[in-house]
């Protein structure tokens, strides 16, 4: 079995986690992709997913999570804006490929969000904060609910760096509410 590895990000409340998941262009360009959280002893939970088929460079927002799938680059970009302490946890990108199990994109992300002032005088993160000023148009997300049992057995033991959060504490918008937003370049 391939050894699972983690990449750790320690960020402050209010900051943005901005990561990219690399995938094989020929196989997965139009496949539906998802961002999941993995909690100890539980199945990975899908927080947001792209459309099916996944559209190129077409941002999808679910609460504070923004997904953009760049087919021409073979990259799924995931942003979690306005981070809260409760967002701390272990995350992963997966590709849905029914009827087969979801394909996990390496590496997993260990996010640790701490309280405290994130910026320096004059710092500016408007490019992501502007997200909240956009009038939303919503559609129903069709995120598959199945999760690979194999993925669960691979879930690593809880890291000492992990800030544990009860299930009810991660307050993300209902996954069925998808908001289209313009690209922030």
């Amino acid at each position: 079995a391939t050894k699972l590895t983690e990449e750790k990000y320690e960020l402050k409340e209010g900051q943005t986690l901005d990561v990219k998941c690399d995938y094989t262009l020929e196989k997965f360009a139009s496949s539906q992709k998802a961002w999941q959280i993995i909690r100890d002893g539980e199945m990975p939970k899908t927080l947001a997913c792209t459309e099916r088929p996944s559209k190129n460079s077409h941002p999808v927002q679910v609460g504070r999570i923004i997904l953009e799938d760049y087919h021409d680059h073979g990259l799924l970009r995931v942003r979690m804006v306005n981070l809260q302490v409760e967002d701390s946890g272990l995350y992963q990108c997966v590709i849905y490929q029914p009827p087969k199990e979801p394909h996990m994109l390496f590496d997993r992300i260990r996010l640790v969000v701490t309280k405290g002032f994130s910026g320096t005088p004059g710092s500016n993160e408007n490019s992501t904060q502007n997200v909240y000023k956009i009038p939303p148009t919503t559609t129903k997300a069709l995120c598959p609910l199945y999760t690979s049992p194999r993925t669960v057995t691979q879930a690593p033991p809880k890291s000492t760096a992990d800030v544990s959060t009860p299930d009810s504490e991660i307050n993300l918008t209902n996954v069925t509410d998808i908001i289209r937003v313009p690209v922030f370049n």
Epitope: E7, L11, D18, L25, G74
Partner: antibody, heavy 119, light 108 residues
Framework: EVQLLESGGGMVQPGGSLRLSCAVS????????MSWVRQAPGKGLEWVSE????????YYADSVKGRFTISRDNSKNTLYLQMNSLRVEDTAIYYC????????????WGQGTLVTVSS | EIVMTQSPATLSVSPGERATLSCRAS??????LAWYQQKPGQAPRLLIY???TRATGIPARFSGSGSGTEFTLTISSLQSEDFAVYYC??????????FGQGTKVEIK
């Protein structure tokens, strides 16, 4: 232990060619993006080129576009940089660097190989 | 292309003192910023990424802060091995990835 070892540097005349290699060990090479970064004598760092792991997408700095080609052989755990039409300003130490899976930041570097372009 | 500007070019500090290095991006890069240390004759070494996360094995005296366009690397109490050149790098969006011109931290 992660290791990156560059080779192929040397002296070449303007207009000439060189092929740099970077042999890696200690991680699953095919999974990670790799970059070449150079440093002219006494100067700062300049990113040159990147090749993604899974997608195989390639990117180049404007200063080398059309002259340099990045490639990789996952079966040999080796990254390459083919440099053609070399110019005096390409003189530098060339480093290969492993990237994070999740972002283009460089967590492991080789010791570099010196390329000197001079007539 | 995102231009990264570091200041000062040279910082003269006594051992045991605090050093504060600045890096400014020409446009917002969110938290997509890394800091590297380079000593003469050596390859760069990753210190900080995501603006504030210490890389594996980096001592706690190194800390990063900032977001958007303004970033700071702080070395709380300079040790002899910390005298080196420090570079910031943005990894926002897509290539080209750009570095600052470097700040040399020298012994006062």
């Amino acid at each position: 232990e992660v290791q990156l070892l560059e080779s192929g540097g040397g002296m070449v005349q303007p207009g000439g060619s060189l092929r740099l290699s970077c042999a890696v060990s200690g991680f699953t090479f095919s999974r990670y993006a790799m970059s070449w970064v150079r440093q002219a004598p006494g100067k700062g760092l300049e990113w040159v080129s990147e090749m993604r792991g899974s997608s195989g997408s390639t990117y180049y700095a404007d200063s080398v576009k059309g002259r340099f080609t990045i490639s990789r052989d996952n079966s040999k755990n080796t990254l390459y940089l083919q440099m053609n039409s070399l110019r005096v300003e390409d003189t530098a130490i060339y480093y290969c660097a492993k990237e994070f899976s999740s972002n283009s930041l460089f967590d492991y570097w080789g010791q570099g190989t010196l390329v000197t372009v001079s007539s | 292309e995102i231009v990264m500007t570091q200041s000062p070019a040279t910082l003269s500090v006594s051992p045991g003192e605090r050093a504060t290095l600045s890096c400014r991006a020409s446009q917002s890069v969110n938290s997509n910023l890394a800091w590297y240390q380079q000593k003469p004759g050596q390859a760069p070494r990753l210190l900080i990424y995501g603006a504030s996360t210490r890389a594996t094995g980096i001592p706690a005296r190194f800390s990063g802060s900032g977001s958007g366009t303004e970033f700071t690397l702080t070395i709380s109490s300079l040790q002899s091995e910390d005298f080196a050149v420090y570079y910031c790098q943005q990894f926002y969006n897509f290539p080209p990835w750009t570095f600052g011109q470097g700040t040399k931290v020298e012994i006062k």
